[in-house]
Interface confidence: low
Amino acid sequence: LQDPCSNCPAGTFCDNNRNQICSPCPPNSFSSAGGQRTCDICRQCKGVFRTRKECSSTSNAECDCTPGFHCLGAGCSMCEQDCKQGQELTKEGCKDCSFGTFNDEEHGVCRPWTDCSLDGKSVLVNGTKERDVVCGPSPADLSPGASSVTPPAPAREPGHSPQ
């Protein structure tokens, strides 16, 4: 025997109180698939969240973060405060990257400067709070005509040149 509720399309629910008639989802609720016995409450983008897409009878609201914050987690489940380049977010707010580390984004953590010596190279441009060091050829490679500059590879150790 076919379930009469299977005929209820998205945007409706199978209302047991009304002989399983397909009733439209009430305001601020939705059903994204057919055959549902209840509608889900729409997500409310409150507080640090703001509405990116309004809820409809067939789809949930989507949130992003207010300016100065960025999304974290699946479906923007959390908002985290932005910091400036050269900073990272701590419990007490945005703090400058400590010496030997950098952050070139408005979120994320400070990362150690590349240690050019691990690749047998030398520091061509010193690192700052906002930028990694730039590695150049090793001193032995600096023969006439040699001018290659390689971008630094991700590394865990800080560069050894002063800021």
Partner: antibody, heavy 114, light 110 residues
Framework: QSLEESGGRLVTPGTPLTLTCTVS????????MSWVRQAPGKGLEWIGY?????SLYYASWAKGRFTISRTSTTVDLKMTSLTTEDTATYFC???????????WGPGTLVTVSS | DIVMTQTPASVSEPVGGTVTINCQAS??????LAWYQQKPGQRPKRLIY???DLASGVPSRFSASGSGTEYALTISDLESADAATYYC????????????FGGGTEVVVK
């Protein structure tokens, strides 16, 4: 880092008044700023925010009569149609959506009386 | 707008005692809650943010907890300097709920 409110005085009902919060030691480009008031012997009452991008958010009761604006180093609160109910100490506060209001000014007293 | 209901309105405890202040939000505020201390004639001072995180420089005698709609501030080992009014504060708004303070709790230290 500090905040200092100014502009509070005795005014008659209906008189407009603008309060100024002067900030030092930090940039208004990095922080949300709020105005909060406190009537004599009463609790704290939030008036509104201005965010880092200059967007404005007001308490429902404050919309229309209170206007927040800012320059590079000041945050202003313009008040119109003042009544005796608006008699209060007005505070500016630094803060926003992550850590609450972490820095407050000493407040400036506005007295509305005929 | 959201409503923050703070209880009790006033509490009196001896030096060395413990005080708990409660704050109930009219809806879930997801731990966007701060607590402030205010002494007469002074500006408020932030004690707690994020419902339970202690602000820098605040003694560990102050602690707080809560989630959803129910929050509490506890002051243990009371000192005379703790005599003040304490406010809870929902601080994360864009639109809709509106920022709100609790009505305040006066703490008297005997």
């Amino acid at each position: 880092q500090s905040l200092e409110e100014s502009g509070g005085r005795l005014v008659t009902p209906g008189t407009p008044l603008t309060l100024t919060c002067t900030v030092s030691g930090f940039s208004l480009n990095d922080y949300w700023m709020s105005w909060v008031r406190q009537a004599p012997g009463k609790g704290l009452e939030w008036i509104g925010y201005i965010d880092v991008g200059g967007s404005l958010y007001y308490a429902s009761w404050a919309k229309g009569r209170f206007t927040i604006s800012r320059t590079s180093t000041t945050v202003d609160l313009k008040m119109t149609s003042l009544t005796t109910e608006d008699t209060a100490t007005y505070f500016c506060a630094r803060g926003g959506l992550t850590y609450g209001f972490d820095l407050w000014g000493p407040g400036t007293l506005v007295t509305v009386s005929s | 707008d959201i409503v923050m209901t703070q209880t009790p309105a006033s509490v009196s405890e001896p030096v060395g005692g413990t005080v708990t202040i409660n704050c109930q939000a009219s809806e879930d505020i997801s731990s966007y809650l701060a607590w402030y201390q205010q002494k007469p004639g002074q500006r408020p001072k932030r004690l707690i943010y994020g419902a339970s995180d202690l602000a820098s420089g605040v003694p560990s005698r102050f602690s707080a907890s809560g989630s959803g709609t129910e929050y509490a501030l506890t002051i243990s080992d009371l000192e005379s300097a703790d005599a003040a009014t304490y406010y809870c504060h929902y601080y994360a708004t864009i639109s809709g709920l509106g920022v709100a303070f609790g009505g305040g709790t006066e703490v008297v230290v005997k």
